[in-house]
């Protein structure tokens, strides 16, 4: 059986939309499937790599690599999107291309970044971990770390940094899929909202879905002990 909830929820474009949340009900009137997984149920994607989930994550990453920061022209906010999802009239799509990106490092101004921009994250403004020396962030936003400390400046002069961020990674469903969403939408969908991250590639949704002990390698499920737990 399914339990359907409908509610008006704030979405990425800053408007309220009617959203449906469909929950598979437990036939035996007990915990939900997500709770059962958290409690240690035999859920194979938590025990070993699941090809379907792996393909989903790779597809999400490929899309994210090509994303940019969509900044609303009315200063109402910004969100990481694909160019096609960013209004040409109501917003500005900030994407580094044609030599407009910042240099990879101050030692070589000529080598410019082509991957980005990312809403609220920039190698020029992140102090920790700083993109410098042997630890220069790659020219691939899906390999960027989470910035834990921004430069102490209320304004950077960068459109994608000075805007009010409207969406962050949200882990939805038992398949460990990730979407950049508003906190309201994420909570309504019973997802896990990552306040600390800016990109889906920075979070490991399956690790969150599975719970219990974190995977040794966040990309590789290793909870073999589930076989004895349930």
């Amino acid at each position: 059986a399914q339990h359907v909830t409908t509610q008006l929820v704030l979405r990425n474009k800053g408007v309220y939309e009617s959203v449906k949340y469909i929950q598979q009900e437990n036939f035996w009137i007990g915990p939900s499937s997500i709770d059962l997984i958290h409690l240690g149920a035999k859920f194979s994607p938590c025990i070993r790599k699941d090809q379907q989930i792996e393909q989903l994550v790779l597809r999400e990453r490929d899309l994210e690599r090509d994303s940019g920061c969509c900044v609303q022209n009315d200063h109402s906010g910004c969100i990481q999107t694909q160019r096609k999802d960013c209004s040409e009239t109501l917003a500005t799509f900030v994407k580094w291309q044609d030599d407009t990106g910042p240099p990879m490092d101050k030692s070589d101004l000529g080598q410019k970044r082509t991957s980005g921009a990312v809403c609220h994250q920039d190698p020029r403004t992140c102090e920790e971990p700083a993109s410098s020396g042997a630890h220069i962030w790659p020219d691939d936003i899906t390999k960027w770390p989470i910035c834990t400390e921004q430069a102490k400046s209320n304004r950077t002069g960068f459109l994608h940094m000075d805007c009010q961020i409207k969406g962050r990674p949200c882990c939805i469903s038992t398949k460990g899929s990730c979407e950049i969403t508003t906190r309201e939408y994420c909570e309504f969908m019973h997802g896990y909202f990552h306040e600390e991250a800016t990109l889906c590639s920075q979070v490991h949704c399956l690790d969150k879905v599975c719970g219990l002990l974190p995977f040794l390698n966040p990309e590789v499920p290793d909870q073999f002990y589930r076989l004895w737990l349930s």
Partner: antibody, heavy 120, light 107 residues
Framework: QVTLRESGPALVKPTQTLTLTCTFS??????????VGWIRQPPGKALEWLAH???????YYNPALKSRLTISKDTSKNQVVLTITNMDPVDTATYYC????????????WGQGTLVTVSS | EIVMTQSPDFQSVTPKEKVTITCRAS??????LHWYQQKPDASPKLLIK???QSISGVPSRFSGSGSGTDFTLTINSLEAEDAATYFC?????????FGQGTKLEIK
Amino acid sequence: QVTLRESGPALVKPTQTLTLTCTFSGFSLSTFALGVGWIRQPPGKALEWLAHIWWDEDKYYNPALKSRLTISKDTSKNQVVLTITNMDPVDTATYYCARITTYYYGMDYWGQGTLVTVSS
Amino acid sequence: EIVMTQSPDFQSVTPKEKVTITCRASQSIGNHLHWYQQKPDASPKLLIKYASQSISGVPSRFSGSGSGTDFTLTINSLEAEDAATYFCQQSYQWPLTFGQGTKLEIK
């Protein structure tokens, strides 16, 4: 507010070494993404970038003058010092110190400049 | 090094006129170009960064455009206080280099 002030001799003899000091306030040279450097302008001519020193001690010099230039900083005193060896009359110019940022590698604040004449 | 060439070297204009100053780079520099204003006996002041981005406190009559090798600084409705020399600067690669300057005289 941010201010920078250059100081040093107004007159130096050929072959001598010039030492210029930039004293700044309103920011710290230990602040991420900031640097202070030197630009000169011969009378009636264009600006020429000489050198910069960054918050993390990185130093960059104009290759055409690199062998003659040394830049250093004293963060506690809010000072940056530039030395130019083997001065020549063609080095006669107004020397400016300016703040630079890795945000765009442009100079957002400048000192008022100090005119240095090289003559025997 | 990248050579920056400005034109014209000198321009005499009347107040309220629209002025355009061009800057050409010896190679493509994307949008890594900044404009400065230097009034007589004063130090330079940053006007425009990244070819077209305005700087807070700079009058809106100043605007910039261009990318690649050709750039333009436009002053809409010139005012007497705009008499100055204008320089462009590239930050595409070390060493940072400037144009030779365009001197603007108000008639």
